[in-house]
């Protein structure tokens, strides 16, 4: 790399992939090993991310630009820039402190990822229960009894003994 | 570069707002920006951390919960609100900026002091 | 809460010798680990990141080494301008409920 010979600012004529080496004169150097400028005139270089454990690269970091990560089979991303990666839960389930745990009766999560939440209270919205909710999913709630003409068939409530919503084991 | 700034002598139980200032580059680009602090005479202590991309994530260090509030202002600045704040806070901030998601920073700032004294 | 813990606290080397600083984290950390260098008045500049590589304009006589627990920095033929103090520093991101990030407590390099 040549030295630059800006008036203004020697730096500024340092291209990315490179930094202004203080140590050499001001001389534009190419960054070093795991490392990378992705703007021109940069006084130092910038570390690149390294996808190690369960993270897996994504894209190589290049003297241009960082790596990416995401996380490898059975983990998924969490945090910025997937920071993070999180264990996989199935359906109707889970992550807590002590590994997954199948949602509690009244709740459910489609995902394999985030928490169990309740199911919709269709009577709030004067609504039937038109389809049962399960740990895996939501209640569908159906038009309100008054809606029904008379013959016509709804879902029956199963009996509480029977904890609706588990599917089987 | 990064500079900080709104360093001051405050009387304790006061509060406080630092500012970090980047140029030469955009908070818009997926970097950390943490703030460390330094007593007189003493070591480094890592207080908080705010991806400045699109999430804006924030990390801080466990003594620092409730008290300190780490925020991305503008698409060049990051801000540092402290609360309740006593001598044990009298220290040189520094903002700190980095790539590699491991807590490891290139790029520093000057530093600015707080000095918590009544 | 991850701790680093830094040894010795102050070393004397003469002029061409050599100067060695230990660190050890308090858990694994893998290769997580930053080496940095501070004179009185600045802030820290950033010598050796990922345990071994070195960063940006550091002088090749600044070599990093180490993984898991334990870290050490070494500076060979060691030169005036290299008195300061160093620290290291380990961590990652693991939760916003549990994340983990220090420094050691420095080493101050005297050179003779």
């Known amino acids: 790399f040549e030295r630059t010979r800006s008036l203004q600012d020697p730096c500024s004529n340092c291209p990315a992939g490179t930094f202004c080496d203080n140590n050499r004169n001001q001389i534009c150097s190419p960054c070093p090993p795991n490392s990378f400028s992705s703007a021109g005139g940069q006084r130092t270089c910038d570390i690149c991310r390294q996808c190690k454990g369960v993270f897996r690269t994504r894209k190589e970091c290049s003297s241009t630009s960082n790596a990416e990560c995401d996380c490898t089979p059975g983990f998924h991303c969490l945090g910025a820039g997937c920071s993070m990666c999180e264990q996989d839960c199935k359906q109707g389930q889970e992550l807590t402190k002590k590994g997954c745990k199948d949602c509690c009766f009244g709740t459910f999560n489609d995902q394999k990822r985030g928490i169990c939440r309740p199911w919709t209270n269709c009577s709030l919205d004067g609504k039937s229960v038109l389809v049962n909710g399960t740990k895996e999913r939501d209640v569908v709630c159906g038009p309100s009894p008054a809606d029904l003409s008379p013959g016509a068939s709804s879902v029956t409530p199963p009996a509480p003994a029977r904890e609706p919503g588990h599917s089987p084991q | 570069s990064l500079e900080e700034s709104g360093g001051d002598l405050v009387k304790p139980g006061a509060s406080l707002t630092l500012t970090c200032t980047a140029s030469?580059?955009?908070?818009?680009?997926?970097?950390?920006i943490c703030w460390v602090r330094q007593a007189p005479g003493k070591g480094l202590e890592w207080i908080a951390c705010?991806?400045?991309?699109?999430?804006?994530?924030t990390y801080y260090a466990s003594w620092a919960k409730g008290r300190f509030t780490i925020s991305k202002t503008s698409s060049t600045t990051v801000t540092l609100q402290m609360t309740s704040l006593t001598a044990a806070d009298t220290a040189t901030y520094f903002c700190?900026?980095?790539?590699?998601?491991?807590?490891?920073?290139?790029?520093w700032g000057q530093g600015t002091l707080v000095t918590v004294s009544s | 809460a991850l701790v680093m813990t830094q040894t010795p606290a102050s070393v004397s080397a003469a002029v061409g010798g050599t100067v060695t600083i230990n660190c050890q984290a308090s858990?694994?950390?893998?290769?997580?680990l930053a080496w940095y260098q501070q004179k009185p008045g600045q802030p820290p500049k950033l010598l050796i990141f990922?345990?071994?590589d070195l960063a940006s304009g550091v002088p090749s006589r600044f070599k990093g080494s180490g993984s898991g627990t334990e870290f050490t920095l070494t500076i060979s033929g060691v030169q005036c301008d290299d008195a300061a103090t160093y620290y290291c520093?380990?961590?990652?991101?693991?939760?916003?409920?549990?994340?983990?990030?220090?420094f050691g407590g420095g080493t101050e390099v005297v050179v003779k």
């Open positions: 858990e694994d950390i893998d290769t997580y």
């Open positions: 705010i991806y400045v991309g699109s999430s804006g994530d």
């Open positions: 990922y345990a071994s």
């Open positions: 700190a900026r980095d790539s590699s998601s491991y807590y490891m920073f290139n790029l």
């Open positions: 030469g580059f955009s908070f818009s680009s997926n970097y950390w």
């Open positions: 520093q380990g961590g990652y991101y693991t939760s916003s409920a549990d994340t983990r990030g220090a």
